[in-house]
Structures are given as C-alpha cells and as structure tokens.
C-alpha cells in the first residue's frame, strides 16, 4: 500500500484552488466502473487534497482510485499531470467495489488500515487528543511532533496535524494509535467499525 496513494496526493496537491474545485465537480459526474459508488457531494466539496486522497482510496482503492484521478485530470486538459500520475502508479490487483458490502471477516479493503480508512471521521470526531498524544509519545511521536500537535488550537486541527505524520508510519505505528483510540474512545471505534 502507499505508492498510488502518494501519487494521487502529489497530483491533487499540485492543483490550484480553482483546479481542485473543478476536479471535485468533474468527479461528481465522471463515469464509474460498474459496482462502484459515488462520493457524496456534500462531503466531497468541503475536502482538501489530503482528505480527498483518502476518500478516493477508501472508495475506489489505490489502483482504480489512481486510474479515476488520471481520467478526471485528463478530462480537465491536464494531460501531463495525468501521465505522471499513471507512470508513478504501480499496477495492483482489482478489488471488490466499495458499493458492494463484504462481510467483516473478508476485510473489505485489504492492506488499508482502519486508521487510514477512517481518517476524515477521526479528524472530525476524536475529542481526547491529549490522551492519544501521551499514549503515542516516545513510541510513535517524537518530541517535536508531540509539541506540534499540542500547539494546534482545536481538536480537529490537532488530529489533522497528527495525521500529517501518518504517511511515514508503518502498520504497527497505526496499530498503536488504534489501540490508544480503543482505550480512550472505544464507542467511536465501535461506531466506525459498524459503518
């Protein structure tokens, strides 16, 4: 996991504010492969490049997510950017469409950690951020990172800052964050798991 996601993020972060807005609007009407659901308009329009990348990967998985992103970029006339994205994306295997529910034991999105899949919801809904930071300090977070997250004024901005470090994390680091979440806000983890 990761190379395609990073390529999508890189492409979206290189769009101007106006281009990103246009990208989202085109994404609402772009033809989708059979069985794939569309990202809800309300959620889509308020997303930044990072949120949108995570949403694309969680809805369409990395391979199709990158292909879809490239199609939209091409449709916007950004051929070079689309080409770069496809060149940077490794060919992965297909997966079950997001619109088709799989039983929990089949791991609907293999290789995608709970933390990655629910990034947007965790940013919006985690309230006990200080507790998380203390649990992760020294194991996952450096002193500098710890202080940077603490310096943010609101819980969502703290969580957004925390998530800015996760691309460098491995699976076990994400597990430690999930464990801390289970211990501090188990009801939230339960709710997200059901969703």
């Amino acid at each position: 996991m990761g190379r395609a996601r990073d390529a999508i993020l890189d492409a979206l972060e290189n769009l101007t504010a106006e281009e990103l807005k246009k990208f989202k609007l085109k994404l609402l009407s772009v033809p989708l492969r059979e069985g794939y659901g569309r990202i809800p308009r309300g959620a889509l329009l308020s997303m930044d490049a990072l949120d949108l990348t995570d949403k694309l990967v969680s809805f369409y998985l990395e391979t199709y997510g990158a292909e879809l992103t490239a199609n939209v970029l091409r449709d916007m006339g950004l051929q070079e950017m689309a080409g770069q994205l496809q060149a940077a994306t490794h060919q992965g295997s297909g997966a079950a469409p997001a619109g088709i529910q799989a039983p929990p034991q089949s791991a609907a999105k293999p290789g995608l950690h709970f933390i990655d899949q629910h990034r947007a919801a965790l940013i919006a809904r985690v309230t006990n951020v200080e507790w998380l930071l203390d649990a992760l300090y020294g194991k996952v977070l450096t002193d500098e990172q710890y202080q940077a997250v603490r310096a943010e004024p609101t819980n969502p901005s703290k969580m957004r800052k925390l998530f800015s470090f996760t691309p460098a994390w491995n699976w076990t680091c994400k597990d430690l964050l999930l464990q801390a979440l289970r211990e501090s806000q188990s009801y939230l983890v339960e709710d997200l798991e059901r969703s």
Partner: antibody
Framework: EVQLVQSGAEVKKPGESLKISCKIS????????IHWVHQMPGKGLEWMGY????????MYNEKFQGQVTISADKSISTAYLQWSSLKASDTAMYYC???????????????WGQGTLVTVSS | EIVLTQSPATLSLSPGERATLSCHAS??????LSWYQQKPGQAPRLLIY???NLHTGIPARFSGSGSGTDFTLTISSLEPEDFAVYYC?????????FGQGTKLEIK
C-alpha cells in the same frame, strides 16, 4: 483455501541458532499480519508478536522482545521466527497464525499452522 | 498487560449436558474477546470472536456472551468431540493475551 504450513520439528543444543518458517498460501501475503504463538509442553498459549509483510513492520510482546526476531520474505510468502542463541526454556510448540482480518487490528486467529516443536537440550 | 482468568480450571460433565465456561479480564476490554478450542496434538481452533460472533463452520451449540470484564462461553448440549481445552483471548490491547485455559473432561 488459506493454508499455513510450518517447517518440521527441531532438536537443538543451548546456544545454537534457529530459524523456523511458516509458508502461506491461499491469499495475498502482504494483506494480513502473521502472528507467532508459543505453547510450552502442557501449558497455555502465549502471543509472541506479529509481522505485517506489507511493510515488514513487527510488533513484539515485551516478554519476547530481544529474544526472538520475526521476519518475512514476500517473494516466497513465508514468515519466520528466529533465535540467535537458544535456551532450554525455549523448548515449546510454536504456531504461526493469521487473523480473521487485520483491517481494524482485531486479532482473532482463524487460521493456524500445524505447529513446530522446538526442543532445546544439551 | 491485561490478565484473563478462566474458571473453572477443570469442568467435568457428561455428553448432552450444558457447559458454561467463564473468562474474567483484569480491565475493561469492551467486546474484544475470542474463544478457542484445542485438542491434544492439534492447533487451537477459533470458535467465537468479538464476544458473541460464531466463526464460520462452528456448530450453533456454541455461543458466547459478555462485555467489559466478564465473558461466558456456553455449549448448549455437549457432544463427545467437545471435550478439550478452551482458551479465551483478548484483542483490546497489546500484548494480546490468553487465559490459562479450562479443561472440559468427560465425567
């Protein structure tokens, strides 16, 4: 069909090194964690740790940290448990196990290897 | 670490009887508990996960319940093949831990 096939029984002397294996088939090796569970003769089960082959990161039970090394070779879909210097107290059955699913890191072990019996005796 | 204490250590019952096995956690583990069966010379076998979910292929006579710190595995009517050792395991936090086991033997 998911299968975990472990290497055969080993008889070793204290101080010797050992690497036992767990060959996986029936699913994409990099999508799920592989765990090692220890069982001393006539005793209960003890979780040693896991490896996530997708990025080769490992998590250890502190009790076994520094005593063993968990690794994986993606090219042959095989996980390993390794000792650099065995002790008599390492005598046990060692199982590799795969969770039902790793997505939310709820590690219920639905698939097990047949076990590798390691005997350490002078 | 979270300590799981199983009781009784040994349970002697006859085929056809109802078996009730308990597992107590040293701290709240929500519903993150599973149950395994192990027979001599065999690897453990998952029966129940997340407190009450019956794993694929496991007979309906097995059921699990509980949340927080107290959990129960119930076998409604014992079959001869059910006599074995049963372990509970928590998945709430690291290190993952198992109970010491309950031996279910024929009376």
């Amino acid at each position: 069909e998911v299968q975990l096939v472990q290497s055969g029984a080993e008889v070793k002397k204290p101080g010797e090194s050992l690497k036992i294996s767990c060959k996986i088939s029936g699913y994409s090796f990099t999508d799920q964690t592989i765990h090692w569970v220890h069982q001393m003769p006539g005793k209960g089960l003890e979780w040693m740790g896991y490896i996530y082959p997708g990025d080769s990161s490992a998590m250890y039970n502190e009790k076994f940290q520094g005593q063993v090394t968990i690794s994986a070779d993606k090219s042959i879909s095989t996980a390993y448990l390794q000792w650099s210097s065995l002790k008599a107290s390492d005598t046990a059955m060692y199982y590799c196990a795969r969770p039902l699913y790793s997505y939310a890191s709820y590690y219920w072990f639905a698939y097990w290897g047949q076990g590798t019996l390691v005997t350490v005796s002078s | 670490e979270i300590v799981l204490t199983q009781s009784p250590a040994t349970l002697s019952l006859s085929p056809g009887e109802r078996a009730t096995l308990s597992c107590h956690a040293s701290q709240n583990i929500n519903v993150y508990l599973s149950w395994y069966q192990q027979k001599p010379g065999q690897a453990p076998r998952l029966l129940i996960y997340k407190s009450s979910n019956l794993h694929t292929g496991i007979p309906a006579r097995f059921s699990g319940s509980g949340s927080g710190t107290d959990f129960t595995l119930t076998i409604s009517s014992l079959e001869p093949e059910d006599f074995a050792v049963y372990y509970c395991q928590q998945g709430q936090s690291y290190p993952l831990t198992f109970g010491q086991g309950t031996k279910l033997e024929i009376k």
